[in-house]
């Protein structure tokens, strides 16, 4: 878990298999989206910083009955060293801003892509 959590600045090393699978799942969600994701459910926006995996999970775990993001929720739990339950919030949440799950997933994916390009692209 220490290894998985330390991706603030990955440099020129590709992601672990687990992180690669998370990115691929986020890609699948964004590319295969037909109807509004999770019926347009809203979640708290988060600061995409070092603790973003736990923050993302804390936000998404409040969405229930949405099979499209269940795999993402399971994957994020593998990146968060502590147990996360619904209603739990960290300081990483932007508590005055709620966004649609679809936008949340897209923002998370874009951020992960930026992180991995950081060490490679000038």
């Amino acid at each position: 878990l220490t290894c998985l959590g330390g991706f603030a600045s990955p440099g020129p090393v590709p992601p672990s298999t687990a992180l690669r699978e998370l990115i691929e799942e986020l890609v699948n969600i964004t590319q295969n989206q037909k109807a509004p994701l999770c019926n347009g459910s809203m979640v708290w926006s988060i600061n995409l910083t070092a603790g973003m995996y736990c923050a993302a999970l804390e936000s998404l775990i409040n969405v229930s009955g949405c099979s499209a993001i269940e795999k993402t929720q399971r994957m994020l739990s593998g990146f968060c060293p502590h147990k996360v339950s619904a209603g739990q919030f960290s300081s990483l949440h932007v508590r005055d801003t709620k966004i649609e799950v679809a936008q949340f997933v897209k923002d998370l994916l874009l951020h992960l892509k930026k992180l991995f390009r950081e060490g490679q692209f000038n």
Epitope: P12, V13, P14, P15, R20, I23, V27, L110, K113, K114, F116, R117, Q120, F121, N122
Partner: antibody, heavy 119, light 107 residues
């Protein structure tokens, strides 16, 4: 469907520059990096560099750094590869290809652009 | 820079035979290795990604294996359309590099 359509064949004199275009369609242009690969006649494939169309960030093979420039125009979903100070050994087919993230495979390719450098 | 060495340079086989192509990396690249097929006058086509993951639309006779530094592309029971040049590609780190290719020709 995903398509990468490149500009037509070009003939240049040694010392000149060439600019090859690659128009993307069928997907969201800024979601994928565009990479450039060339192939000299009868030779293998050689990676030249890549651009992230969203930020304009680039990465180059050291061999082409300073001589090649990669750009992207988000408004037209078109990527460009300019190669300067052309030599006869730059005669090759130049391909653009897309990659979701650099460690992913090159899943779609342009048809290729033959650039001939001859005096 | 990661150097990929493909062997053999040329493989002469008959339709129906099995082709085994090798790609060796100069350092550990985990499973960040992709395989492409190229026919004369055409752009390369992706066959296998992450060393062993198959692509939809690619016949099941194509399979990949390996991890670390040694990788193999296997074509079970060659079809006439399989005679082409095959390249492996390092996806581990920049510069992205490709092997010199293996030409599979009709015996």
């Amino acid at each position: 469907q995903v398509q990468l359509v490149q500009s037509g064949a070009d003939v240049k004199k040694p010392g000149a520059s060439v600019k090859v275009s690659c128009k993307a369609s069928g997907y969201t242009f800024i979601d994928y990096e565009i990479h450039w690969v060339r192939q000299a006649p009868g030779q293998g494939l050689e990676w030249m560099g890549a651009i992230d169309p969203e930020t304009g960030g680039t990465a180059y093979n050291q061999k082409f750094k300073g001589r090649a420039t990669l750009t992207a125009d988000k408004s037209t979903s078109t990527a460009y590869m300019e190669l300067r100070s052309l030599r006869s050994d730059d005669t090759a087919v130049y391909y653009c290809t897309r990659i979701l993230l650099y460690y992913y495979p090159m899943d779609y390719w342009g048809q290729g652009t033959l650039v001939t450098v001859s005096s | 820079e990661i150097v990929l060495t493909q062997s053999p340079a040329t493989l002469s086989l008959s339709p129906g035979e099995r082709a085994t192509l090798s790609c060796r990396a100069s350092q550990n690249i985990s499973d960040y290795l992709h395989w492409y097929q190229q026919k004369p006058g055409q752009a390369p086509r992706l066959l296998i990604y992450y060393a062993s993951q198959s692509i939809s639309g690619i016949p099941a006779r194509f399979s990949g294996s390996g991890s670390g530094t040694d990788f193999t592309l296997t074509i079970n029971s060659l079809e006439p359309e399989d005679f082409a040049v095959y390249y492996c590609q390092n996806g581990h780190s920049f510069p992205l590099t490709l092997g010199g290719g293996t030409k599979v020709e009709i015996k």
